[in-house]
């Protein structure tokens, strides 16, 4: 018996085509992925092959002014539209609290939405039952498939749960849930996820029952042969795990933004068992037509995105300084407008011991494109935040050594005064050059804000202690030349889209003032 | 709206069997599962088994293993539920209920068939 | 199997009091319990599922609360037509087993 898996993950709110490097779509002609696009590749697929299976494996909420505007009533839409069979939550999910994730999403999706390490517990377990479940059994053809689902624990930390809901250990959560199935008599078990590739693999291993893992969180891409576009393959699609039961599992992901449809085809003999596994992501190019009535119910719901890009955020009492000629040189009060709100984007008081799990932001300057004058009434919008970060990139938390910061603060100065990208924008760090020393060697203070402490204050940088810190994807990603930070960070949890992060800051705050106030020093 | 409507009261002989039917409408047929549950009277209620009609797809309680035969007919939407080797304390209601394929509580109920054995 | 023990077997109560009826499973069974009604004659009618999520059209008086073995049904303001049997059913391993049920009956 032949099953089909199609799959997504991590598509983040890109219900429009976008360019190849998942930013706004500028030559329509180049672009890629998009719902209409996914919807004719997926007709076509489920007219052409009988047992077909369409799964997302989570982080479907943020990224775009679509999620901004629409707080994932499009996602409940869309994906009704595309006749999706199952969705595992992912963190991101939880981004607006649980109000955000049941009334919208829970409440509209025509689809099962699965994590079985998620409990909840006090008033919400009521409010909450039945509108996501452990599993789900899906009749496929003549047979049953069972899909059970998971998210990372980490999701109290990357988002914004609330406590009524535990996040459990994967593995343990969902190993009973697996031999309930089984009791079922349900032999064919796909575990749908959101945990990213490393605990895929593992589930891969540990998890008596599982056939195959369906993952995302890491926008792992795998690809069998000459990869089309220009993400490199982390493995093979699939990625083959022997489990510790000496099974063969195959483990897959479809990088994220829409831009692949992950296409694998399982072969199972009469008792479940895995006989052949094979297929590749599919890339969304231009070659793939968008559907027409999936595009036109795009273009009718895109009218509102246009209506609130002009409307006022809050406003400024002094000038926003995002001029290459101050962000690329000096320390400037846009660069800390955008860190202050990357750190209050990310308080989570979940630990009595700690203020908040973190404290630090860096932003490259060169990331910061445009400022904005105070003298059109103060008035900011998300048109003018689009200028200043126009690169549709997130904000994200990572865990870094002492020894790695200390690195990226000697590359932010490293040829200092040539109007470059790298120079760093802070918060919650204070640091001291020497531009009279020579590269390599210019730091000669860098203190951090204290996050174990009830009255935060500044230490001294301990080189071999790890930090969180919250930086953008471009860095994380080792851009700007940042390779240490790419090579040796311990942890990445892809975070907020960037504008969100800001106008969400600029919402709540209502009227803003940042000053230069020192974080950035010369001696 | 979903109807489980179930054939006529039996009376049987000791050693004797019997077919009990269970007609389904008002929902689709071969999505879910149709259990077999059943009460003697003045006692509780006892589950015996149940098939998917997707698949025929049968799963028995033990005690009832060898005893009982459960069949489908999708185009009628029909389960049937044979019990054989009868014996007195066979004597009860028999129930059809439609229960979810993974989650296995019963929401609808067919209105019950007695089925007597007595010599 | 798993034994689903419900206790009391029998109860009387007047109308207006707060009944709590109460299912104990042999071992853990993950929050798969339901409860059903049963009048005389009838049909069992489900009333919750999950433990705590109320069929439509059930009355917001009944709830059911608990989770691993134990397990309970409250009725917070018991009405005449509520005199009846009630049944626990769990329904994490095979087979599916109920309670010996509990009896309500008017003081």
């Known amino acids: 018996w032949e099953l089909t898996i199609l799959h997504t993950n991590d598509v983040h709110s890109r219900l429009e085509q976008t360019s190849e490097d998942s930013s706004k779509c500028v030559n329509a002609s180049r672009c890629m992925g998009g719902v209409a696009r996914l919807f004719t590749k997926v007709q076509q697929i489920r007219r052409a092959e009988p047992n077909v299976l369409l799964l997302d494996a989570g982080d479907q909420y943020q990224g775009t002014i679509w999620f901004t505007v629409y707080k994932g009533a499009e996602v409940a839409h869309f994906m009704n539209a595309l006749r999706y069979d199952a969705m595992a939550l992912g963190n991101h999910e939880f981004d607006n609290g649980v109000e955000g994730l049941i009334e919208p999403l829970l409440k509209e999706a025509k689809f099962p939405i699965l994590s079985a390490n998620i409990k909840a517990k006090g008033p919400l377990a009521s409010q909450i039952s039945g509108l996501y479940l452990p599993y789900k059994v899906l009749p496929v053809g003549d047979e049953v498939v069972g899909i059970v689902g998971y998210t990372s624990k980490e999701t109290p930390f990357l988002s914004n749960p609330g406590t009524n809901l535990v996040f459990e250990d994967e593995i343990t959560a969902l190993q009973p849930e697996v031999d309930k199935l089984k009791t079922l008599n349900v032999n064919k078990i796909i575990a749908l996820g959101h945990s990213g590739f490393e605990m895929d693999k593992l589930i891969a291993q540990k998890v008596r029952g599982v056939d195959v893992v369906v993952g995302g969180h890491s926008n792992t891409f795998l690809y069998t042969g000459n990869p089309p576009s220009k993400e490199v393959p982390a493995g093979k699609y699939p990625f083959i795990v022997t489990s510790d039961d000496g099974r063969k599992v195959p483990v897959v992901q479809a990088y994220a933004f829409g831009k692949y449809l992950g296409y694998l085809k399982i072969e199972f003999d009469e008792r479940g068992n895995v006989i052949s596994s094979h297929g590749n992501p599919i890339l969304l190019n231009s070659s793939i037509p968008e559907d027409p009535s999936i595009k036109a119910d795009i273009n009718k719901w895109r009218i509102k995105l246009d209506n609130y890009s002009t409307q006022e955020l809050g406003k400024t009492i002094v000038y926003l300084d995002g001029s290459s000629q101050s962000c690329r040189f000096r320390e400037c009060n846009m660069g800390n407008l955008i860190c202050d709100a990357m750190i209050n984007n990310n308080l989570r008081h979940t630990d009595e011991m700690f203020w908040n799990h973190v404290s630090m932001c860096i932003l490259n300057g060169g990331g910061i494109r445009s400022p904005i004058d105070e003298r059109n009434n103060g008035t900011i919008t998300w048109e003018n935040l689009a200028a200043v970060l126009p690169f549709g990139g997130t904000f994200d938390l990572v865990q870094l050594k002492g020894s790695t910061l200390k690195k990226a603060f000697e590359h932010s100065v490293h040829r200092y005064g040539q109007s470059t990208g790298e120079f760093l924008q802070v918060g919650g760090i204070h640091v001291v050059y020497d531009l009279s020393r020579k590269p390599g060697d210019r730091v000669v203070k860098l203190d951090v804000l204290c996050t174990k402490c009830r009255v935060p204050s500044y230490d001294p940088l301990k080189m071999d202690e790890v930090y969180k810190v919250i930086l953008p994807n471009f860095l994380a990603n080792g851009g700007d030349g940042f390779q240490m930070i790419k090579d040796e960070l311990l942890r990445h949890d892809s975070g907020d889209q960037d504008i969100n992060v800001v106008s969400t800051y600029i919402s709540k705050m209502k009227v803003i003032y940042p000053a230069v106030e020192g974080r950035i020093k010369f001696s | 709206q979903v109807q489980l409507v179930q054939s006529g009261a039996e009376v049987k002989k000791p050693g004797a069997s019997v077919k009990v039917s269970c007609k389904a409408s008002g929902y689709t047929f071969t999505t879910y599962n149709m259990h077999w549950v059943r009460q003697a009277p003045g006692q509780g209620l006892e589950w015996m088994g149940a098939i998917f009609p997707g698949n025929g797809h049968i799963s028995y309680a033990q005690k009832f293993q060898g005893r009982v035969t459960m069949t489908r007919d999708t185009s009628t939407s029909t389960v049937y539920m044979e019990l054989s080797s009868l014996r007195s304390e066979d004597t009860a209601v028999y129930y059809c209920?439609?229960?979810?394929?993974?989650?296995?509580?019963?929401?609808?109920w067919g209105q019950g068939t007695l089925v007597t054995v007595s010599s | 199997d798993i034994q689903m023990t419900q206790s009391p077997s029998s109860l009387s109560a007047s109308v207006g009091d707060r009944v709590t009826i109460t299912c104990k499973a042999s071992e853990g069974i993950y929050n798969r319990l339901a409860w059903y009604q049963q009048k005389p004659g009838k049909a069992p009618k489900l009333l919750l599922s999950g433990v705590i999520s109320l069929e439509t059209g059930v009355p917001s008086r009944f709830s059911g609360s608990g989770s691993g073995k134990d397990y309970t049904l409250t009725i917070s303001s018991l009405q005449p037509e509520d005199f009846a049997t009630y049944y626990c059913q769990q329904y994490w391993s095979i087979p599916w087993t109920f309670g010996g049920g509990t009896k309500v009956e008017i003081k």
């Open positions: 209920a439609r229960g979810d394929y993974d989650e296995s509580y019963f929401d609808y």
